[in-house]
């Protein structure tokens, strides 16, 4: 049964989906494969802390250690990437803090931008000095393990020299890599000694070997590609928002709720209210009023602006966000001060530092 009673009919008009959702990332912790990662649950007064990854309960194992408010991942792998949450259970309530873990190397071998000028990779030799192939820029080849999110572009580079100028070919898992081996094929830029695969998918996982050879010798270098898949999740609200605010009677105030959702989010601003002098209905559930919601007639639903406030506006304001997967909500309190308590400060005191005058 629902955990509140609506004071009035709040039938919502159909939503006009935005072309792009407002995205505010939760905190992101990045680790390279093989590294250890330690994260502290940023919640206070936790009697019991439970952990989840992508909505699934996380228990200790040979690589995951849970001690108090700390989560330790030893020898991280790309499969440890995902949306994590710690939930602090208290005697009266519970609170959840979300963060992302990204176990990944750089998306490409070397800079993606440097293809505009790859001349330094293409070394011309004096025609008399015959020479077997050699690497000209080993720095761009140091990262062997590449963990890349699905749908991204990958570039592997093997800058080389030699005389005569060596040729380059690529193997996948030790066998000749042919265009028909992947949807959309791949690009080889010989001038830049690079292999480029666009929109990678899980079947692209594997070992990629560049073989550089001329009549005087052959060298090779192997990269390992892991493709990290993402999965849909319920909305995430930026920690600390909306923030508590105070203003004087007659002043203005804004509450801000920043939403991260890769599916259409529906935002509601809700306030606890009284009906017939009571805050609770006959069923014991609190009376709530929807003040604003996302939809056709609602501009910037992430911001709730209150103008010319009265003492009756004081109280708790809830930002509740839902998508087809689930919900999230966070709340803040508005304190309304008598005018004489704040002389000369009648303009807004905003709920977010981003909006301070």
């Amino acid at each position: 049964r629902p955990s509140f009673s609506l004071v009035e009919d709040t039938t919502l008009e159909p939503e006009e989906p935005p072309t792009k959702y407002q995205i505010s990332q939760p905190e992101v912790y990045v680790a390279a494969p093989g590294e250890s990662l330690e994260v502290r649950c940023l919640l206070k007064d936790a009697a019991v802390i439970s952990w989840t990854k992508d909505g699934v309960h996380l228990g200790p194992n040979n690589r995951t250690v849970l001690i108090g408010e700390y989560l330790q991942i030893k020898g991280a792998t790309p499969r440890d990437s995902g949306l994590y949450a710690c939930t602090a259970s208290r005697t009266v309530d519970s609170e959840t803090w979300y963060f992302m873990v990204n176990v990944t190397d750089a998306i490409s071998s070397g800079d993606d931008e440097d293809d505009t000028d790859g001349a330094e990779d293409f070394v011309s030799e004096n025609s008399n000095n015959k020479r077997a192939p050699y690497w000209t820029n080993t720095e761009k080849m140091e990262k062997r393990l590449h963990a890349v999110p699905a749908a991204n572009t990958v570039k592997f580079r093997c800058p080389a020299g030699g005389n005569p100028m060596p040729t380059m070919r690529w193997l996948k898992n030790g066998k000749e890599f042919k265009q028909e081996h992947r949807i959309g094929g791949y690009k080889v830029r010989n001038q830049h000694w690079s292999l480029i695969m666009e929109s990678v998918v899980p079947s692209d996982k594997g070992n990629y070997t560049c073989v550089v050879e001329n009549e005087y010798g052959s060298i090779n270098h192997t990269y390992h590609l892991d493709v990290v898949e993402r999965s849909p999740h319920r909305p995430i609200l930026q920690a600390g928002l909306p923030a508590n605010a105070s203003t004087v009677v007659g002043g203005d105030v804004e509450f801000v709720c920043k939403v991260y959702s890769d599916a259409q989010p529906h935002i509601q601003w809700i306030k606890h209210v009284e009906k017939n002098g009571s805050k609770y209905g006959p069923d014991g559930l609190p009376y709530l009023k929807v003040l604003k919601h996302s939809g056709i007639n609602s501009s910037n639903a992430e911001v709730l602006a209150l103008f010319n406030v009265t003492e009756a506006d004081a109280g708790e304001y809830i930002c509740k966000v839902s998508n087809y997967i689930g919900q999230a909500n966070q709340s803040a309190w508005l304190t309304v001060l008598p005018k004489q308590q704040a002389p000369g400060r009648e303009k807004e005191i905003t709920a977010s530092p981003d909006y301070l005058e």
Epitope: P17, G55, Q264
Partner: antibody, heavy 114, light 107 residues
């Protein structure tokens, strides 16, 4: 592993009610919506409604508002869908699905016949 | 309600063929589209979500594209095990509506 296990097939009389259960395991029940979808014999899929078990918020397809009631019991990680005033055209397989629609129950066949 | 019009309603193709199914929404749904595969007597199986993201474990021959009102689902090289009915679904606005389905058969 994530599982949604539904109650068994039911045969009901027109005008009566049916209550189908869906027991979830392998994930945090309160962190995802539970959707209910039905499929009449040889027909397509139709969304009935959903519930967010953490607070009991439910949303319905207007075609079923007043006839369908979706509830959830957090203590047993079980969602329920009750359909009242049954008629022959309610004969269908009823599915529950986790919020992301990545996991579905095996389906419950409800037959309405006099 | 947003109507999802799926076409064709049925199609016959040979193993190895490239198969394309389209879905058109009566209103824009950004990229909030999913594609499912359903075999007789079984529950639907999620293949693609958010228009173009392949769900975990789904073979790479399945792909999706599009945004707004027009969406496409493609099987790059049809396999015998792909014989099923395929549905699109918008999950932008309630009620979450499905296309009427495309029954795929082998020639």
């Amino acid at each position: 592993q994530v599982q949604l296990v539904q109650s068994g097939a039911e045969v009901k009389k027109p005008g009566s009610s049916v209550k189908v259960s869906c027991k979830a395991s392998g994930y945090i029940f309160t962190s995802y919506n539970v959707h209910w979808v039905r499929q009449a014999p040889g027909q397509g899929l139709e969304w009935i409604g959903s519930i967010y078990p953490d607070n009991g918020d439910s949303t319905y397809n207007q075609n079923y508002r007043g006839r369908a009631t979706i509830t959830a019991d957090k203590s047993t990680s079980t969602a329920y869908m009750e359909l009242s005033s049954l008629r022959s055209e309610d004969t269908a397989v009823y599915y529950c699905a986790r919020g992301d629609f990545a996991y579905w129950g095996q389906g419950t066949l409800v037959t309405v016949s006099s | 309600d947003i109507q999802m019009t799926q076409s064709p309603s049925s199609l016959s193709a040979s193993v190895g063929d490239r198969v394309t199914i389209t879905c058109k929404g009566s209103n824009g749904v950004s990229n909030d589209i999913a594609w499912y595969q359903q075999k007789p007597g079984k529950a639907p199986k999620l293949l693609i979500y958010s228009a173009s993201y392949r769900y975990s474990g789904v073979p790479s021959r399945f792909s999706g594209s599009g945004s707004g009102t027009d969406f496409t689902f493609t099987i790059s090289s049809l396999q015998p095990e792909d014989i099923a009915t395929y549905y699109c679904q918008q999950h932008s606005t309630t009620p979450y509506t499905f296309g009427q389905g495309t029954k795929l058969e082998i020639k």
